[in-house]
Interface confidence: low
Amino acid sequence: VEVQVSEDPVVALVDTDATLRCSFSPEPGFSLAQLNLIWQLTDTKQLVHSFTEGRDQGSAYSNRTALFPDLLVQGNASLRLQRVRVTDEGSYTCFVSIQDFDSAAVSLQVAAPYSKPSMTLEPNKDLRPGNMVTITCSSYQGYPEAEVFWKDGQGVPLTGNVTTSQMANERGLFDVHSVLRVVLGANGTYSCLVRNPVLQQDAHGSVTITGQPLTF
């Protein structure tokens, strides 16, 4: 028996369902009573889901997995993972045994889009050209870690005096806070771009300082 999986990682959004595709080529006369199908975590060998002794043994992993029972006899051994969490990310091995056996691993990449950044300014009043200000760009609930880029009003990248911190919250999603320290010109726009490298999703925020008032 030959097991086939997708070579590219499966990308799944947090809280959505993902299908980890796995297939084998059944011989003529194949019956499900012959099938031993095991899904396990590649690294730890923890059992995820199994089909043995002619029946679905159910989920051994978070009760969030399912097979496609009607398609098994056709050689479809794919695994459905429901309500994906950050901790589901990783490699899963599909192991198929009939008379002989084969296995293959598929990677699950979890992703979550970042929120539109919120911009804060410190100090936020009585600003004068030449003042040093701190602009903070905050974006929330993304995964994996973001790439953060700052630009001025002319689109020129600002790389100096930037400090970016990323903290995982209780769901493993990241909150990103990027701080730009800059000396004010007469007026100016400062833009922050938070990029999710897996989704290629860009979230933009900007602050424009034109004397008073400030516009965000």
Epitope: Q46, Y61, S62, N63, R64, V86, T87, A168, N169, E170, R171, G172
Partner: antibody, heavy 121, light 107 residues
């Protein structure tokens, strides 16, 4: 079936610290969150914080920030809650709780038996 | 922090009664609400999650409804085993917060 077994009751002096343990069995310890919830005598439930062992991340309620430390030892499937600078109002039953493998990190299907911490001079 | 306000704080009832306990959130929590039952000297027991989903093994006389800021727990026909305290808990945001509790006692 997840089981959570906590350490025994303790009596502590004001200003001291206490460390309560919670040993988990019957589930994949590292992949679920362990929360600590306390209940003062005759009072309601109060969430203190949680740890997600697989991520090594702890979160605390602001009220306890700086006084509570939640840790986990994956090798023994045990979570710990240490509360420092104890005062009389910390007298309570302390529970560890989690959602098990089948629920969320935010609701609690499984609870320890509770550990009574009495703070008294 | 999100404040959870339960009412009433005490409820006197008889076996067979239909009971409704209300929980109000200080801000919108969508459907991220759970209900627990607690008996004296015991740990709480999860009854309802996501406002209306019955936890496995919980009798169908318990039901939950609501979304946003207003939620209710209903017991259609009170049984002797149901005399206990009930707590709501929001899990929309950190910190997780509980309501003050409702004690259901025998009339």
């Amino acid at each position: 079936q997840v089981q959570l077994v906590e350490s025994g009751a303790e009596v502590k002096k004001p200003g001291s610290s206490v460390k309560v343990s919670c040993k988990a069995s019957g589930g994949t310890f590292s992949s679920y969150a362990i929360s600590w919830v306390r209940q003062a005598p005759g009072q309601g439930l109060e969430w203190m914080g949680r740890i997600i062992p697989i991520l090594g991340i702890a979160n605390y309620a602001q009220k306890f920030q700086g006084r509570v430390t939640i840790t986990a030892d994956k090798s023994t499937s045990t979570a710990y809650m240490e509360l420092s600078s104890l005062r009389s109002e910390d007298t309570a039953v302390y529970y560890c709780a989690n959602g098990g493998d089948s629920s969320s990190w935010y609701t609690f299907d499984y609870w320890g038996q509770g550990t009574l911490i009495t703070v008294s001079s | 922090d999100i404040q959870m306000t339960q009412s009433p704080s005490t409820l006197s009832a008889s076996v067979g009664d239909r009971l409704t306990i209300t929980c109000r959130a200080s801000q919108n929590i969508n459907s991220w609400l759970a209900w627990y039952q607690q008996k004296p000297g015991k740990a709480p027991k999860l009854l309802i999650y996501k406002a209306s989903y019955l936890q496995t093994g919980v009798p169908s006389r318990f039901s939950g409804s609501g979304s946003g800021t207003e939620f209710t727990l209903t017991i259609t026909s009170l049984q002797p085993d149901d005399f206990a305290s009930y707590y709501c808990q929001q899990y929309d945001s950190n910190p997780l917060t509980f309501g003050g509790g409702t004690k259901v006692e025998i009339k």
